[in-house]
C-alpha cells in the first residue's frame, strides 16, 4: 500500500508510518515501528505533559515560591501542572500568577466595593453622600452617617465622605 | 527498519578506559532512546543505561554512576558508551538497543579486562 | 534496584505448554504496565517477544502469551517447540528512568 500522508486523530506521521500520540502523562520513548506501537514511558515525580503528545521531556510542575508570596492551590498531577496562588492578603500579579503584591487598602474616603482574591486586587469605590470611611482598609465598606433623628438627636456636624455625622442634644430653648 | 552496528571486540587493562560505539541507520536518529545492556559470561542482563538521542540527556543505573558516560554524535547517527576504571569483572558482551523496550539490538561487543 | 526474580530453569515436553513468572516489587513490576520479555538462545542477542505486559511485536507466533498480576508477570509458551529452547529474561520500568531484569530462566525442552 501506498506510505500515508496524513494520519488520523492521536496520530502522528514520521518514516512514512503513522505512530500512535503517547497520552497525557507519557513522554515519547521511540516511534512505532512495523513490528511494535510507540513506546511511552510515564512522567516523573513532579512532571506532566497535558496533551497527547511527541514529547521526548515531560514539563517540570510549576513551583510556587513562598519568597514570592506563593502557594499551593492545586498540586500538580502526571497530566497537569500545579496551580499557584497567593497567601493571605496578597494576590497574583499575573494571570500566570507568577508573583504576589499585597492587597491595597482603600483610603479614608474610599471603601471596599470587593474584597480582593487570591488572584484580584481590592476594588475601592469613593463614598457616596451619606456614606463615609474613615480608614485606610482591605476589608471596610462605606458606612453609612449615624442617622441622629432616630436617636432623638441633631445633626451638629454635617458628615463627610471620612467622617460621620457629629450628633447632639436638640435645643431646648426653642418652643 | 532500525539496524544497530556496534564496534569490534576489544581487550583492555584493569584500571583502563573502553569506548563502544553503536551506529543506527534506518527510522529517524532523533526519534528513539538508546539503552546499553551488558552481560557477563553466563550471567544474566544487567541495564547499565540508556541516551536519548534528541537532548543528548542520559539516566544510568546506579551501580554504574560515576563510571558510565553516554554520548551521541547525531552528524553520525551514532551513540557510544565509555566505561572507565575497568576490573576483570567488567568483562562482558555489551549491546546498545533501541528505546527502553528494546524492541532492535546490535550484535553486540565483547570487552575483555585482563592484566 | 535489585533484579527482578525468576526461576533459574523451567522444562517441558514437545507440544506442552510452560509459564515462566518474574517478581519483582510495587516500585516496578506492580507499579507500572512496562514488562517485557525477551529470548535469547546461545551466541545470539537477546530478542524482543513481549512488551507492555502482554502485546506480541509483529512476527512473534501466538504461542508466547504473558499477564500480570500485582507484583507478579507471568511469560506462557505453548505447544512447546525444539527451538523455543533459550534463555528468557523479563524487564520492568522502574521509575525515573531506570530499567530493571530479571536474572533470567533457562527453557529446557525435554
Known amino acids: 500500500p501506498e506510505p500515508p500522508t496524513a494520519c488520523r486523530e492521536k496520530q502522528y506521521l514520521i518514516n512514512s508510518q503513522c505512530c500512535s500520540l503517547c497520552q497525557p502523562g507519557q513522554k515519547l520513548v521511540s516511534d512505532c515501528t512495523e513490528f511494535t506501537e510507540t513506546e511511552c514511558l510515564p512522567c516523573g515525580e513532579s512532571e506532566f505533559l497535558d496533551t497527547w503528545n511527541r514529547e521526548t521531556h515531560c514539563h517540570q510542575h510549576k513551583y510556587c515560591d513562598p519568597n514570592l508570596g506563593l502557594r499551593v492551590q492545586q498540586k500538580g498531577t502526571s497530566e497537569t501542572d500545579t496551580i499557584c496562588t497567593c497567601e493571605e492578603g496578597w494576590h497574583c500579579t499575573s494571570e500566570a500568577c507568577e508573583s504576589c503584591v499585597l492587597h491595597r487598602s482603600c483610603s479614608p474616603g474610599f471603601g471596599v466595593k470587593q474584597i480582593a482574591t487570591g488572584v484580584s486586587d481590592t476594588i475601592c469605590e469613593p463614598c457616596p453622600v451619606g456614606f463615609f470611611s474613615n480608614v485606610s482598609s482591605a476589608f471596610e465598606k462605606c458606612h453609612p452617617w449615624t442617622s441622629c433623628e432616630t436617636k432623638d438627636l441633631v445633626v451638629q456636624q454635617a458628615g463627610t465622605n471620612k467622617t460621620d455625622v457629629v450628633c447632639g442634644p436638640q435645643d431646648r430653648l426653642r418652643a | 527498519q532500525v539496524q544497530l552496528v556496534q564496534s569490534g571486540a576489544q581487550v583492555k587493562k584493569p584500571g583502563s578506559s573502553v569506548k563502544v560505539s553503536c551506529k543506527a541507520s534506518?527510522?529517524?536518529?532523533?526519534?528513539?532512546?538508546i539503552s546499553w545492556v551488558r552481560q557477563a559470561p553466563g550471567q544474566g542482563l544487567e541495564w547499565m543505561g540508556m541516551?536519548?538521542?534528541?537532548?543528548?540527556?542520559?539516566s544510568y543505573a546506579q551501580k554504574f554512576q560515576g563510571r558510565v558516560t553516554m554520548t551521541r554524535d547525531t552528524s553520525t547517527s551514532t551513540v557510544y558508551m565509555e566505561l572507565s576504571s575497568l576490573r576483570p569483572e567488567d568483562t562482558a558482551v555489551y549491546y546498545c538497543?533501541?528505546?527502553?523496550?528494546?524492541?532492535?539490538w546490535g550484535q553486540g561487543t565483547l570487552v575483555t579486562v585482563s592484566s | 534496584q535489585s533484579a527482578l526474580t525468576q526461576p533459574p530453569s523451567a522444562s517441558g515436553s514437545p507440544g506442552q505448554s510452560v509459564t515462566i513468572s518474574c517478581t519483582g516489587t510495587?516500585?516496578?513490576?506492580?507499579?507500572?504496565?512496562?514488562v517485557s520479555w525477551y529470548q535469547q538462545h546461545p551466541g545470539n542477542a537477546p530478542k524482543l517477544i513481549i512488551y507492555d505486559v502482554r502485546k506480541r511485536p509483529i512476527g512473534i507466533p501466538d504461542r508466547f502469551s504473558a499477564s500480570k498480576s500485582g507484583n507478579t508477570a507471568s511469560l506462557t509458551v505453548s505447544g512447546l517447540q525444539a527451538d523455543d529452547e533459550a534463555d528468557y529474561y523479563c524487564?520492568?520500568?522502574?521509575?525515573?528512568?531506570?530499567?530493571?531484569f530479571g536474572g533470567g530462566t533457562k527453557l529446557t525442552v525435554l
Open positions: 524487564s520492568s520500568y522502574a521509575g525515573n528512568n531506570n530499567l530493571v
Open positions: 541516551i536519548n538521542p534528541s537532548g543528548g540527556t542520559t
Open positions: 534506518g527510522g529517524t536518529f532523533s526519534s528513539y532512546a
Open positions: 510495587s516500585s516496578d513490576v506492580g507499579a507500572y504496565n512496562f
Open positions: 538497543a533501541r528505546g527502553f523496550r528494546m524492541d532492535q
